[in-house]
């Protein structure tokens, strides 16, 4: 039985040209996390594997950086980065948990951040 829950940064906004940290955290389960995938819609951004570390997709190498922790930092944001992002936790023995974050990239300087995780 899957008892875990994923907390995420929720709906967040950031300024064009800036950077943002996407964070998820799996709690309420003793399952071992073996890998975390970060995806944007259907595109794989990055993988963090418990044994092999990080792999950033080549097409995102210049704008995506791993961390903090299992989070992901997106840099040089453009309006095209607006959309859904998913953190997919592969665990044993529970299986897969998925968290969703919606990022809106704004032209103006009125970007507000989600409250659950604090973004620098």
């Amino acid at each position: 039985m899957m008892t875990g829950t994923i907390e995420t940064t929720g709906n967040i906004s950031a300024e064009k040209g800036g950077s943002i940290i996407l964070q998820c955290h799996l709690s309420s389960t003793t399952a071992q996390v073996t890998q975390v995938n970060w995806e944007q819609q259907d595109q794989l951004l990055a993988i963090c594997n418990a044994d092999l570390g990080w792999h950033i997709s080549p097409s995102f190498k210049d704008r995506v950086a791993p961390g903090p922790g299992l989070g992901l930092t997106l840099q040089s944001l453009t309006v095209n980065d607006t959309g859904e992002y998913f953190c997919i936790y592969h665990t044993y023995p529970d299986g897969t948990y998925t968290g969703r974050i919606f990022l809106e990239v704004l032209e103006s300087s009125v970007a507000e951040h989600g409250a659950r995780f604090q973004i620098p």
């Epitope: 907390e7 940290i21 955290h25 709690s27 003793t30 996390v33 975390v36 963090c48 594997n49 418990a50 092999l52 570390g53 990080w54 792999h55 950033i56 190498k61 210049d62 950086a65 791993p66 961390g67 903090p68 922790g69 299992l70 930092t73 840099q75 659950r116 995780f117 604090q118 973004i119 620098p120």
Partner: antibody
């Protein structure tokens, strides 16, 4: 097995700069963040920042921006930290530590820096 | 930045005694890491993600907590457990460490 070998102790004059190294072995250097942590008897452990050697991305503690510069040479699997404009407050042991999402799992032995006036 | 307050700063325990130390965060954090450091050596990852034991850590250690309150417990103190234990958060930049709890053998 991952292993981080740090450069030796440094005795440097106030106002000068120091550059220390952290040579990684036993794992893929470009797949893990490399953190730097300062330890002093009075302040305990302080996180300075990290570099991701895979693309050179750095994330600094605001307190150390302009004071510390992190770089990495992927050809030699070595991370570096330069500390500039040294003062007595920079006298400390500096650790490098590997992190791949699940906390800092391997640490170097530390580099002791003593600033003399 | 989030301030982590560890208590007690120093404690002593006899072999076989149960030990609990705490780490209190100035703001809510999602998880906590713990490191063990013995005099003259580097810190070692000890407990990560609040409750997961690092490789090689004896099962007498456990971690728990949520929000602003976290703890590390040793079910039965042994001589080799004498060390300083640091908590660390990375819910927000910058990552911060507690000042440490020094555990001595009585």
């Amino acid at each position: 097995q991952a292993y981080l070998q740090q450069s030796g102790a440094e005795l440097v004059r106030s106002g000068a700069s120091v550059k220390m190294s952290c040579k990684a072995s036993g794992y893929t250097f470009t797949s893990y963040n490399m953190h730097w942590v300062k330890q002093t008897p009075g302040q305990g452990l302080e996180w300075i920042g990290y570099i991701y050697p895979g693309n050179g991305f750095t994330n600094y503690n605001q307190k150390f921006k302009g004071k510390a510069t992190l770089t990495a040479d992927t050809s030699s699997s070595t991370a570096y930290m330069q500390i500039s404009s040294l003062t007595s407050e920079d006298s400390a042991v500096y650790f490098c530590a590997r992190e791949g999402g699940w906390a800092m799992d391997y640490w170097g032995q530390g580099t002791s820096v003593t600033v003399s006036s | 930045q989030i301030v982590l307050t560890q208590s007690p700063a120093i404690m002593s325990a006899s072999p076989g005694e149960k030990v609990t130390m705490t780490c209190s965060a100035s703001s809510s954090v999602s998880h906590m890491h713990w490191y063990q450091q013995k005099s003259g050596t580097s810190p070692k990852r000890w407990i990560y993600d609040t409750s997961k034991l690092a490789s090689g850590v004896p099962v007498r250690f456990s971690g728990s907590g949520s929000g602003t309150s976290y703890s590390l417990t040793i079910s039965s103190m042994e001589a080799e457990d004498a060390a300083t234990y640091y908590c660390q958060q990375w819910n927000s930049n910058p990552s911060t460490f507690g000042a440490g709890t020094k555990l001595e053998l009585k």
